[in-house]
């Protein structure tokens, strides 16, 4: 199709090389087609970005989208040759930076309802480029932490190094819906809910005499509660002895909690004590099986092919810890009778 | 508790203007948005549109844009509608009506509401 | 704009009904749905928000259901404080808007 009806937005992606980010494209298409084509809804916050359920079909997407080869070559559909770029309904979501990301992306709408609607389309000319070591070192991480029930602010990443008074307006997205009443670099959040969990989108224009680019940062905001005080707990093994039959296969699982860390480095392993000797046995990857707000349990089992004799005459320990401790469960075998 | 006190009744002339005041009280100003909604006698509910008191930011609805102004006052922790070139069919019940969630968020419910102040517009 | 239609506009029912209000949106608003109650001379009350959430204070008679464009506010075993007139409203874009009301009205 000709893209030279398209209308033209031009987007920077300055990307931090110190720490994983995100980016998302939107598809702006102009009034009145976007009304029927995006229909922004709402998703639990561990949901992101928003789903933008179609009117007519609720599994085509809505759009399609097209990148522009620089050389000329046909349009090349997003979803056949770029698998780090997930096309969510309206949204375009790049999981990982890059230069290579620089280019020019198409939208338009997935399916043609009247003869105006063939050329609404969008063009975006996306450059991508990374953050210069001169900017600010302490400038907002794309990944950040409001604890619930306190007050906490949202930063967007590009303009963070600058004071309130200095920044340009920016627009605010949650989960791809327009936050019309804040347009300040920095969203103050008095009370910390659940809610406010989500993906949020900052723009600025940054212009030079040539042109004007919309300069874009994606932020994961997650709402965590405080990190605990406690050592972890195990939960299982409750008894201190377990009755075996001898030749049979074994399993005994270490099942513990652990209370919420920001930074959270769980550690569980299964040691064997037999007579002065201690060592840790090499058993299955630890799995969590259970995570909320505030914390997670996790379980590691150790496996025996066949209890043996020897085991009888052995302890088998579960070995947890976090930052604040460690807690010991040991388990003796006993023959059943 | 939370509370919204609206200013008295008015009774204006056509062409003139009113300023109606909507003053918080039980909770955190600046952390919830607040919306204008209106009444004509007999008539159902309108939106006109809302204010972030933290920053004055502000969002008309299209019908009232250009005649209506959205104020705050933080130091009061009052809000103020101002319609200008007001006309007969302006006459109604103004209220305003706190946002149910702690900003910034999609707009949920309106949870609670002033008592209404009544405008007159008669020549 | 989204249009809001509720239906019936009227409706006349005894003490202990069940009755059922809808509402339809001329596009889909995912649960973004908030229902009122209104009583003459009065401001209007929040019963349910995001489509089924019961606002806190409210009789755990009222009910809310729906998603996309079809609603449903349901009174289980209506009382007679319940006589008023109730309205939806969509937040999911500006302008917010309501729709037309509903009166419940003594049989």
């Known amino acids: 199709f000709n893209i030279s009806g398209c209308s033209t937005k031009k987007l920077l992606w300055a990307y931090s090389t110190r720490s994983e980010e995100e980016f998302i494209l939107f598809c702006d298409l102009p009034e009145p087609q976007k009304s029927h084509f995006c229909h922004r809804s709402q998703l639990s916050p561990t949901q992101v970005p928003d789903h933008l359920p179609f009117t007519d079909s609720k599994d085509l997407p809505d759009v399609q989208w097209y990148r522009q080869p620089s050389n000329g070559d046909p349009l090349e559909d997003i979803r056949k040759s770029y698998p780090h770029i997930i096309q969510d309904k309206c949204t375009l979501r790049f999981l990982t930076p890059g230069v290579n990301n620089t280019g020019s992306y198409i939208c338009r709408p997935k399916m043609i309802k009247s003869p105006y609607d063939v050329a609404c389309c969008v063009k975006m000319i996306l450059e991508v480029k990374p953050q210069s070591n001169a900017s600010c070192e302490n400038s907002a991480s794309h990944k950040q932490d409001l604890l619930l029930g306190s007050t906490g602010s949202i930063s967007c990443p590009s303009l963070s190094c600058q004071s309130d008074a200095q920044s340009p307006e920016v627009t605010w997205y949650k989960n791809g819906k327009l936050l019309s009443m804040t347009r300040s670099n920095r969203i103050v959040v008095d009370e910390v809910y659940i809610y406010h969990q989500g993906t949020y989108v900052c723009d600025y224009t940054q212009s030079d005499t040539a042109s004007s680019w919309t300069v874009r940062a994606v932020v994961q905001v997650r709402t965590i509660v405080g990190d605990t005080k406690l050592k972890p707990d195990i939960l299982d093994p409750v008894e201190s002895t377990l009755e075996v039959e001898l030749g049979k296969p074994l399993t005994i699982s270490c099942k513990a909690r652990f209370g919420f860390e920001r930074v959270f480095n769980p550690v569980m392993k299964w040691y064997i004590k037999d007579a002065d000797l201690e060592w840790e046995v090499s058993v299955p990857e630890a799995k969590s099986i259970k995570s909320t707000l505030k914390d997670e349990i996790i379980e590691r089992n150790i496996i025996l092919e066949k209890v043996t004799q020897r085991d009888l005459r052995r302890t088998f320990v579960c070995f947890v810890q976090n930052s604040i401790g460690n807690t010991t469960q040991s388990v003796q075998l006993k023959e059943k009778r | 508790q939370v509370q919204l006190v609206q200013s008295g009744a008015e009774v204006k002339k056509p062409g003139a203007s009113v300023r109606v005041s909507c003053k918080a009280s039980?909770?955190?100003?600046?952390?919830?948005?607040m919306h204008w909604v209106r009444q004509a006698p007999g008539q159902g509910l309108e939106w006109m549109g809302i204010?972030?008191?933290?920053?004055?930011?502000?969002t008309y609805a299209q019908k009232f844009q250009g005649r209506v102004t959205m104020t705050r006052d933080t130091s009061t922790s009052t809000v103020y509608m101002e319609l200008s070139s007001l006309r007969s069919e302006d006459t109604a019940v103004y209220y305003c009506a706190k946002e149910g969630r702690v900003s910034p968020t999609d707009y949920y419910g309106m949870d609670v509401w002033g008592q209404g102040t009544t405008v007159t517009v008669s020549s | 704009d989204i249009r809001m239609t509720q239906s019936p506009s009227s409706l006349s029912a005894s003490v202990g009904d069940r009755v059922t209000i809808t509402c339809r949106a001329s596009?889909?608003?995912?649960?973004?749905l908030n229902w009122y109650q209104q009583k003459p001379g009065k401001a209007p009350k929040l019963l349910i928000y995001d489509a089924s959430s019961l606002q806190s204070g409210v009789p755990s008679r009222f009910s809310g259901s729906g998603s996309g464009t079809d609603f449903t506010l349901t009174m289980s075993s209506l009382q007679p404080e319940d006589f008023a007139t109730y309205y939806c409203?969509?937040?999911?874009?500006?302008?917010?808007?309501f729709g037309g009301g509903t009166k419940v009205e003594i049989k």
């Open positions: 409203q969509q937040s999911y874009s500006t302008p917010l808007t």
């Open positions: 039980g909770y955190t100003f600046t952390s919830y948005y």
């Open positions: 204010i972030n008191p933290r920053g004055g930011y502000t």
């Open positions: 596009q889909s608003i995912s649960s973004y």
